[in-house]
Interface confidence: low
């Protein structure tokens, strides 16, 4: 099966590249996951997204666990997922009425 992901191979500053022009078709039977990398720097939040093989993505995300501290300067987080466009924007929380 072919999966679609958001892809921006160069780091984007304060742009999570989750718009339609960043959608790509991943390589069948090779790239079976979507990957998202988030780096928090003094200039802002850097995003990089791509298709990935499950092996490569899981190695990367495991290796960076100790550097992932969301909200902290120099935090680096890598996440992997395996559904179409799953490395897109996080769903907005609905306000409670």
């Amino acid at each position: 099966l072919q999966i679609q992901c958001y892809q921006c191979e160069e780091f984007q500053l304060n742009n999570d590249c989750s718009s339609p022009e960043f959608i790509v078709n991943c390589t069948v039977n090779v790239q079976d996951m979507c990957q998202k990398e988030v780096m928090e720097q003094s200039a802002g939040i850097m995003y990089r997204k791509s298709c990935a093989s499950s092996a490569a993505c899981l190695i990367a995300s495991a290796g960076y666990q100790s550097f992932c501290s969301p909200g902290k300067l120099n935090s680096v987080c890598i996440s992997c997922c395996n559904t179409p466009l799953c490395n897109g924007p996080r769903p907005k929380k609905r306000g409670s009425s």
Epitope: E10, R48, A60
Partner: antibody, heavy 122, light 107 residues
Framework: EVQLVESGGGLVQPGGSLRLSCAAS????????IHWVRQAPGKGLEWVAR????????YYADSVKGRFTISADTSKNTAYLQMNSLRAEDTAVYYC???????????????WGQGTLVTVSS | DIQMTQSPSSLSASVGDRVTITCRAS??????VAWYQQKPGKAPKLLIY???FLYSGVPSRFSGSGSGTDFTLTISSLQPEDFATYYC?????????FGQGTKVEIK
């Protein structure tokens, strides 16, 4: 299959120049970083230089700064190490290597070439 | 530059032995340490990255631990193909630096 093949080594006189090549296959160098690491005969490993071909960022060891230049041609999927003003202490086997987790502090070199010997002697 | 000091510089061991190699960084490098194996005339091979993560295809008898300044590579049961030289490397700062190597020889 990922492969790195170095070439260009040989015997050169002190003060001379050489250009080493590192031809990559099985992956695109623009999605990674390429390092050169050297090993003098009977000695340990010494990092020399690094390039990130996607943005052209380069780093050098102090021992080679100003004499060596690392570059890459993404259309040929090849990295280069131009070595000028060579000294006897530059004699070593030169390896190119690919990194994983390249963009942060946890990178490591997962694929290495077979090495090419550079001998600087008169 | 960060100094990486390995000990011992060499050791003799027998097949089946548990072998431990240590690496000390001159300053805190978090978990940014890799371990490589090198055999004579060959390129180094990656064993461990991020201090404790086993690289793909590496036998599970190899393990790494540590953070900060003190790191360990352990071979739980030495096999004939493990006789080689082992290097640690820090990637926390540029320039990256290697330990001087530990040669594991047959007793």
């Amino acid at each position: 299959e990922v492969q790195l093949v170095e070439s260009g080594g040989g015997l050169v006189q002190p003060g001379g120049s050489l250009r080493l090549s590192c031809a990559a296959s099985g992956f695109t160098i623009s999605s990674s970083s390429i390092h050169w690491v050297r090993q003098a005969p009977g000695k340990g490993l010494e990092w020399v230089a690094r390039i990130t071909p996607s943005d052209g960022t380069t780093y050098y060891a102090d021992s080679v700064k100003g004499r060596f230049t690392i570059s890459a041609d993404t259309s040929k999927n090849t990295a280069y190490l131009q070595m000028n003003s060579l000294r006897a202490e530059d004699t070593a086997v030169y390896y190119c290597a690919r990194c994983i987790l390249c963009f942060g502090p946890l990178w490591a070199m997962d694929y290495w070439g077979q090495g090419t010997l550079v001998t600087v002697s008169s | 530059d960060i100094q990486m000091t390995q000990s011992p510089s060499s050791l003799s061991a027998s097949v089946g032995d548990r072998v431990t190699i240590t690496c000390r960084a001159s300053q805190d490098v978090s978990t940014a340490v890799a371990w490589y194996q090198q055999k004579p005339g060959k390129a180094p091979k990656l064993l461990i990255y991020s201090a404790s993560f086993l690289y793909s295809g590496v036998p599970s008898r190899f393990s790494g631990s540590g953070s900060g300044t003190d790191f360990t590579l352990t071979i739980s049961s030495l096999q004939p193909e493990d006789f080689a030289t082992y290097y640690c490397q820090q990637s926390y700062t540029t320039p990256p630096t290697f330990g001087q190597g530990t040669k594991v020889e047959i007793k």
